[in-house]
């Protein structure tokens, strides 16, 4: 009996036309939502004038439906048993699941000012930037609508910066009508233990953002894993959002709509400093902000963001060192709300429920030559927003899963 089941599972998790896995893989049957909480700065003037702690108040959720578009350019390669595809991006605002509208205003760090002052360190260029910042009536902080902040706005300061500069700024700009990839993953035809594992991303096996093993593209995209998952496994996956591969470890058994699943979580060790976790040495890319690689819980992804000083962390600086959150007031990290988990059905390796949580931060530094940054006496890693991307298998799909997979085994 067991062998027959194994044989059936192996057949059905292959990523090719006609299998259960393929149908759900091309277009997810799960509704996926991305909730945003924006950190509204309460004391912009005091920060700019006196280098005070930044007081933030999170506002949200503002919810978008995402991942509703089918994979594009799906191409099988029989020679190396891979399938390549593009994952199109799309977001639809869901007013009924949100606390306000896309027109709500927020006081946030001026993204262009922070980024430009970081990219251009030369004092004479900074004098020019200062001139253009003042001329455009820009400041250290700005008021922007949710729509502007997420999806893009024409920045008045960047509009004065001479060629060739993208004058549109947004945390997720450009998003709609773009696609992530090309991904090339193993289809599992020759070896089921490799199914869904990424072979190449954008035509390469490495990212070119990090040194050594940190630069590797490991595992799957976390939507599924090779079948027959064991609790002892460390599940590797790649997330283009954070420009790196990461891993999850088993935490607990969970019953999801009558389906036994394994809950895998991203452990705090994955965010530790190299002092605590030597494997992380290659994620420490500079010595000053990281305090000689002793800070932890924030990832400098500037190399992946055209030099813009973007730092990724867990929401509310969960698992981050005290020095990171010290200049920010109003944060309340807690594991239940702010960690990432994947609920995986172990027989098929399918992720039936997940919560991906991350926070987008921007570094801003004092600058003698830029008036609006002149009074700062320290560096700030400023939280802009955090997001919670969730998906849960629907009731109908869960019934089908119970009857066709777990029911047959029990």
């Amino acid at each position: 009996g067991d062998l027959l089941i194994q044989k059936t599972i192996k057949k059905q998790v292959v990523l090719e036309e006609g299998t259960i896995a393929f149908k759900n893989w091309v277009k997810t049957g799960t509704e996926v939502y991305r909730q945003f909480w924006i950190f509204d700065v309460q004391n912009p003037q005091e920060v700019m004038m006196n280098s005070s702690n930044i007081q933030v108040k999170q506002r949200g959720p503002y919810t978008y439906r995402v991942r509703f578009l089918a994979k594009e350019n799906v191409t099988q390669d029989a020679e190396d048993n891979t399938v390549s595809f593009l994952q199109p991006n799309g977001a639809i605002f869901e007013p009924s699941l949100s606390v306000g509208t896309e027109a709500d205003n927020f006081t946030v760090l001026n993204l262009a000012v922070a980024a430009a002052s970081h990219i251009y360190q030369n004092q004479f260029v900074q004098m020019i930037l200062n001139s253009l910042i003042n001329k455009s009536k820009s400041s250290m902080f700005q008021v922007r609508t949710l729509r502007e902040l997420l999806w893009g706005y024409r920045d008045p300061f960047l509009s004065l910066v001479p060629y060739p500069v993208t004058t549109t700024v947004g945390l997720f700009y450009p998003y709609n009508n773009t696609a992530d990839g090309v991904y090339k993953v193993f289809n599992g035809k020759d070896n089921i233990s490799k199914v869904a594992i990424i072979d190449t991303y954008k035509g390469k096996r490495n990212l070119s953002y990090w040194e050594s093993h940190c630069d590797m593209i490991n595992g799957t995209d976390a939507a599924s894993f090779p079948p027959f998952v064991e609790k002892s496994q460390v599940l590797q996956f790649f997330s283009s959002d954070i420009c790196r591969s990461i891993y999850a470890v088993f935490e607990s058994d969970v019953n999801l709509k009558g389906i036994p699943v394994y809950r895998f979580v991203l452990p705090s060790k994955a965010f530790a400093s190299p002092v605590e976790n030597p494997d992380n040495y290659c994620f420490c890319t500079e010595k000053i902000i990281s305090k000689n690689c002793t800070s932890y819980g924030v990832l400098d992804i500037s190399k992946c963001k055209e030099g813009r000083p973007v730092y990724i962390s867990l929401p509310h600086f969960l698992y981050a060192s005290p020095d990171v959150s010290e200049p920010i007031d109003g944060l309340n990290p807690n594991e239940e709300e702010h960690r990432t988990y994947l609920d995986i059905e172990p027989i098929t390796g399918f992720t039936l429920q997940f919560a991906k949580r991350l926070q987008v931060n921007l570094l801003v530094k004092p600058s003698e030559k830029i008036q609006v940054l002149k009074n700062l006496k320290r560096n700030y890693i400023v939280p802009i927003l955090w997001l919670n991307e969730t998906g849960t298998i629907g009731d109908e799909k869960a019934n089908m899963f119970r009857s066709q997979v777990t029911g047959k085994i029990n």
Epitope: I119, Y120, V125, P162
Partner: nanobody
Framework: QVQLQESGGGLVQPGGSLRLSCAAS????????MSWYRQPPGKERELVAL????????DYADSVKGRFTISRDDAEKTVSLQMNSLKPEDTAVYYC???????????WGQGTQVTVSS
Amino acid sequence: QVQLQESGGGLVQPGGSLRLSCAASGFSFSTYAMSWYRQPPGKERELVALITTTGGTTDYADSVKGRFTISRDDAEKTVSLQMNSLKPEDTAVYYCSAWRATLLKPYWGQGTQVTVSS
């Protein structure tokens, strides 16, 4: 290669005028912001005037506002600084500079000396 050549400096009495010119070559002039900096004796170099690309937004140091005017001629690849009501504190070496977003630091000319003295 990139060249910026300043001219028009000299000795002038307080209250007098001078027009500095900067001839550019070796780069696509019209896509660069052009600036004049100056370095008074024993002091740091400072930004005096700036003119951006098309649209020609201009900006000036507070100390020269209303007295100095920057202008550019993209066809001739020149940038000029008209200096009126000159004061002794305007004495400095004046440098022409070109910058755009692809550069981490600006291009510089050799500088021209301006001395305001009676």
